[in-house]
Structures are given as structure tokens and as C-alpha cells.
Interface confidence: low
């Protein structure tokens, strides 16, 4: 006869490991007992369990509640055991010793490999600002056994560098993604992809890039000169800019306070029915946590009685 077993048994952390040991013999042969032991280079041989044809399963107290026989139906020649809820410390060498009658004893040795799937963590780098040089966008760390693979999936142009720390029972891999920040990267996904034999599918963690910037400011509203005549209603000036974080807008008048009746609503300056008193230099001040910009325009409210005058539009930052 002979033993049917496996050289390597691979199981994911927390799952049950079936350690196979089946005696394939002649019909008249019987298995008296199967002794299971853990073979540890440091601790030597420790008994795991004993399967006896008469007295059943006896489990070493150190493995109490952790070793069972496979569920019925069971073949009397099957000496396999289940190691419940495998942990990293279970990884190592195991042997089964089978006592048969009349053929004698057989033994087999196998390695239990416990895969520890990584639980990746993504750490965003320092705040990204347009104008910076090569900057850390994010780092992604995954620790597992064996060492996981950590890569990046993104449309953003950048560089990645990885390093690993090897521990006695696992390896931690850290990959860093560096880029030169630009506003076009805003809202772009940066995904850490972790592959590992203990995972059914890759683990993905996505970080949405935020790049601080502030665009130049400009003022719209003076394009139609006909709107800026005495008596006209609904005249507005709109300050145009964009930024991240979204900018705040502030309106002032360079040559004095804002005229009464002029309403500030965010980026828009609304005028009451126009009078010549509304003529002047208006300044839009745009700011966010990164920077600030100014744009000014000269408003000249024309009196229809004096058509010779023209609207003057001056923008400056």
C-alpha cells in the first residue's frame, strides 16, 4: 500500500486546512491508527492528534477545539484531519504516521502554507499644489504572506517606487506614487491595486486627487455697451475664475465705497437702475487658501444725451 497526500497544502488565513493522509491498500488491509505531528525546527516534533480505529480522535490539548476529522461519510482508511481557523503560526511542516495491519507503518510529510491576504492602506501625501515639483501623491502599504504585489492604476502621469520590509512570517510592501501636480489632475482617481494569491480578486483603494490652484480672474458684463446706459436695469458684473479649493469672491470699488443699491452675490455684482453715479473702477478680488487674484474694470454709465462717450473695459490682474 501507499499514502496519498500532498506536498503542499495551501489555505487562506482563517479558513480550515485539510491535511490529507489516505491509505491506499489492499482490500484486506486495515488502518489501526494515524498519528499527526507538527515538525518544528525550533520546538521539535509535537503531537497534533491521534486517530485510533477503536478509541476515536484524541487531540493534543494545545490544539483543543482546533483539530477535527472531516465530516461523514468517512472511509476507515482516511486519516485526514481538519485544522480549524488556520493562523500564521500554523504554517510549517506536518507529518502523518499510519499504522496498518498487516502491512506495517507508512509516513508522509507535507508543508502547510497559510496565505495572509493583505489589508492595504492608502495614505495620501501632503497637500498637492500646482507649481510644486515632483511630489508624493499617495503611498499604499500592504502586508501579507507571501509578499503582496502593490501597483497603481491611474491615467495620471507619475512615477512609482516600491520597497518591502520582510518580517519573520510576512512581508510589507509600500509603494509610493509621485507626480508633478497640475490642475488637470483634479478629481482624477489614483487607485492602489494589491494582488495576492490569497485574494480571489485584486483589492483596490481609490484616492481622488485634489490639486490646489487658482486661475487668473476676469470680469464679464461690459461686452454689451447698450446695457450700461442711464436708466437701464439688470446690469451685472460677473467675476470669472476657478480654483481648488473653490475661491471666494469680494467686490470693491477703487474710487470709493460701493454705491447704494449695488448688490454683491458671490461672484456677481448686481446694479439697480443705472445712474452716472455707478461709473467707476470696480475690483473683483478672488482668493482661496493657495493664492489670490484681482481683476478690475472701469464702468462708465453713458447718458443717452451724450452718445459720444464709449464704454472703457480695462482688465488687470
Amino acid at each position: 500500500g501507499e499514502l496519498e497526500t500532498s506536498d503542499v497544502v495551501t489555505v487562506v488565513l482563517g479558513q480550515d486546512a485539510k491535511l490529507p493522509c489516505f491509505y491506499r491498500g489492499d482490500p484486506d488491509e486495515q488502518v489501526g491508527q494515524v498519528a499527526w505531528a507538527r515538525v518544528d525546527p525550533n520546538e521539535g516534533i509535537r503531537e497534533l492528534a491521534l486517530l485510533h480505529s477503536k478509541y476515536g480522535l484524541h487531540v493534543n490539548p494545545a490544539y483543543e477545539d482546533r483539530v477535527e476529522q472531516p465530516p461523514p461519510p468517512r472511509d476507515p482508511l482516511d486519516g485526514s484531519v481538519l485544522l480549524r481557523n488556520a493562523v500564521q503560526a500554523d504554517e510549517g511542516e506536518y507529518e502523518c504516521r499510519v499504522s496498518t495491519f498487516p502491512a506495517g507503518s507508512f509516513q508522509a510529510r507535507m508543508r502547510l502554507r497559510v496565505l495572509v491576504p493583505p489589508l492595504p492602506s492608502l495614505n495620501p501625501g501632503p497637500p498637492l499644489e500646482e507649481g510644486q515639483g515632483l511630489t508624493l501623491a499617495a503611498s499604499c502599504t500592504a502586508e501579507g504572506s507571501p509578499a503582496p504585489s502593490v501597483t497603481w492604476d491611474t491615467e495620471v502621469k507619475g512615477t512609482q517606487s516600491s520597497r518591502s520590509f520582510t518580517h519573520p512570517r510576512s512581508a510589507a510592501v509600500t509603494s509610493e506614487f509621485h507626480l508633478v501636480p497640475s490642475r488637470s489632475m483634479n478629481g482624477q482617481p489614483l487607485t492602489c491595486v494589491v494582488s495576492h494569491p490569497g485574494l480571489l480578486q485584486d483589492r483596490r483603494i481609490t484616492h481622488t486627487l485634489q490639486v490646489a490652484f487658482l486661475a487668473e480672474a476676469s470680469v464679464r458684463g461690459l461686452e454689451d455697451q447698450n446695457l450700461w446706459q442711464v436708466g437701464r436695469e439688470g446690469a451685472t458684473l460677473k467675476c470669472l475664475s476657478e480654483g481648488q479649493p473653490p475661491p471666494k469672491y469680494n467686490w470693491t470699488r477703487l474710487d470709493g465705497p460701493l454705491p447704494s443699491g449695488v448688490r454683491v452675490k458671490g461672484d456677481t455684482l448686481g446694479f439697480p437702475p443705472l445712474t452716472t453715479e455707478h461709473s467707476g473702477v470696480y475690483v473683483c478680488h478672488v482668493s482661496n487658501e493657495l493664492s489670490s487674484r484681482d481683476s478690475q474694470v472701469t464702468v462708465e454709465v453713458l447718458d443717452p444725451e451724450d452718445p459720444g462717450k464709449q464704454v472703457d473695459l480695462v482688465s488687470a490682474s
Epitope: 495614505n123 517606487s161 520597497r163 520590509f165 518580517h167 509600500t174 509621485h178
Partner: antibody, heavy 120, light 111 residues
Framework: EVQLQQSGPDLVKPGASVKISCKAS????????MHWVKQSHGKSLEWIGR????????SYNQKFKDKAILTVDKSSTTAYMELRSLTSEDSAVYYC?????????????WGQGTLVTVSA | DIVLTQSPASLAVSLGQRATISCRAS??????????MHWYQQKPGQPPKLLIK???NLESGVPARFSGSGSGTDFTLNIHPVEEEDTATYYC?????????FGGGTKLEMK
């Protein structure tokens, strides 16, 4: 403002144990490893180990694996290092230090240090 | 473990001159992109202060007279021009693998 406030100096007898604390404030405690560093008088620095405040998992310099135990209390954002079976060789200043990104940037924040003196 | 050997052990430099401190690692601590080597300054009674990270990146708030260079196994910290307040001990440290290790230190004094 990131601050690491360590417990005061300790005078302990040989064979005894001591537990040093490091109270963290001004940042997300669970987001960064806490490291411990030893500096004997007039000597260089030795990395003892690090603890992950998120799950309490720790990694040690093999030289200190039987000497130091690193723990954390998330509720009080405090890291602890217990030193056991003290001898005169353990007399030193011990620092906690915060690691921004797994060591890749070095130790940017340090506690003020705790002097441990082992003497009969 | 990676061993970091610093030289010289002590150094006396005149004000305004250049101080150069070397650190040699027993194995490479450089990837294709970065070197995992850092420099610290320590004054008596104080914890170390991070000066340079990634071999050459100046930490925020550190004067520009400090600079770092090198890759692979050989790294250098330069201070120029040296000022009185630079009197201290300087250490290199790697974060390539666990355990992290520090160099033996270089004591800088003014002539």
C-alpha cells in the same frame, strides 16, 4: 500642532520594570506609526521598534524583542513602552518619535525624551 | 541589519567655512527614484531634529546652508557657511528596512 509629551524621569532598581508613556496630540493618532528610540549617555541612537496605534501590531529590533513591549491606548492617544528585567545597560534616554510615512521621511516629530536610570 | 558608518567622529570648522560629514551604508539604500537616508541634528539635552530627508530634501524650516547628497551606499551632509548655532552632533539614519539604524554620530565644533 503635533506634540509628543513623554512621562518624567524614572529611577529604578536592577531587575525591575518601567513603563514610559508618550501622549500624542495635534494629529490623527491611529494614522501614524509610533517609534521608540534609545540613546545611552554620550552614545548614538538605537531604534527599538514601532507600534501601529490602529491595531496595536508592533515590530521590534531583534536586539530589544525581549526587553521592550510596545502598546497603545487609542482612547487616550497614548503609546507606552515597558522595559523589563532592567540592568545598568538600560540606563538611557528613551524617545518616542512619529513616523509620517513608514519611515520613508524619517522621524519628523520627537518627544522630549525620558531618562531612565537603573541603579541599586 | 544595515550598518551606517559615519566619518569623521568629530569635526572642528571655522565660522563661515564648509563642514562635510560622510555616512556609508553596508548595503545600498537607494531605489531608482529615491534614497532612504535621512540626517538629524542633535544639541545637548534636546531630541534629534530632522534636517534632510530622502538624502537631499531639506526639511521645512531648516536653513538652506544645510544640504545633502549621495546615493547607493555613500551619503554626505554639507553645512556651508557654518554658523555658531550649528554646534551639535549629526546623525544619519536609514529607513530601507526594519530595523532602522543610525550612524554613530559626528560632533561638530567651532574652531
Amino acid at each position: 500642532e503635533v506634540q509628543l509629551q513623554q512621562s518624567g524621569p524614572d529611577l529604578v532598581k536592577p531587575g525591575a520594570s518601567v513603563k514610559i508613556s508618550c501622549k500624542a496630540s495635534g494629529y490623527s493618532f491611529t494614522g501614524h506609526y509610533m517609534h521608540w528610540v534609545k540613546q545611552s549617555h554620550g552614545k548614538s541612537l538605537e531604534w527599538i521598534g514601532r507600534v501601529n496605534p490602529n491595531n496595536g501590531g508592533s515590530s521590534y529590533n531583534q536586539k530589544f524583542k525581549d526587553k521592550a513591549i510596545l502598546t497603545v491606548d487609542k482612547s487616550s492617544t497614548t503609546a507606552y513602552m515597558e522595559l523589563r528585567s532592567l540592568t545598568s545597560e538600560d540606563s538611557a534616554v528613551y524617545y518616542c518619535a512619529r513616523d509620517p510615512l513608514g519611515g520613508s521621511y524619517g522621524f519628523a516629530y520627537w518627544g522630549q525624551g525620558t531618562l531612565v536610570t537603573v541603579s541599586a | 541589519d544595515i550598518v551606517l558608518t559615519q566619518s569623521p567622529a568629530s569635526l572642528a570648522v571655522s565660522l563661515g567655512q564648509r563642514a562635510t560629514i560622510s555616512c556609508r551604508a553596508s548595503q545600498s539604500v537607494t531605489t531608482s527614484s529615491y534614497s532612504y537616508m535621512h540626517w538629524y541634528q542633535q544639541k545637548p539635552g534636546q531630541p534629534p531634529k530632522l534636517l534632510i530627508k530622502y538624502a537631499s530634501n531639506l526639511e521645512s524650516g531648516v536653513p538652506a546652508r544645510f544640504s545633502g547628497s549621495g546615493s547607493g551606499t555613500d551619503f554626505t551632509l554639507n553645512i556651508h557657511p557654518v554658523e555658531e548655532e550649528d554646534t551639535a552632533t549629526y546623525y544619519c539614519q536609514h529607513s530601507w528596512e526594519i530595523p532602522y539604524t543610525f550612524g554613530g554620530g559626528t560632533k561638530l565644533e567651532m574652531k
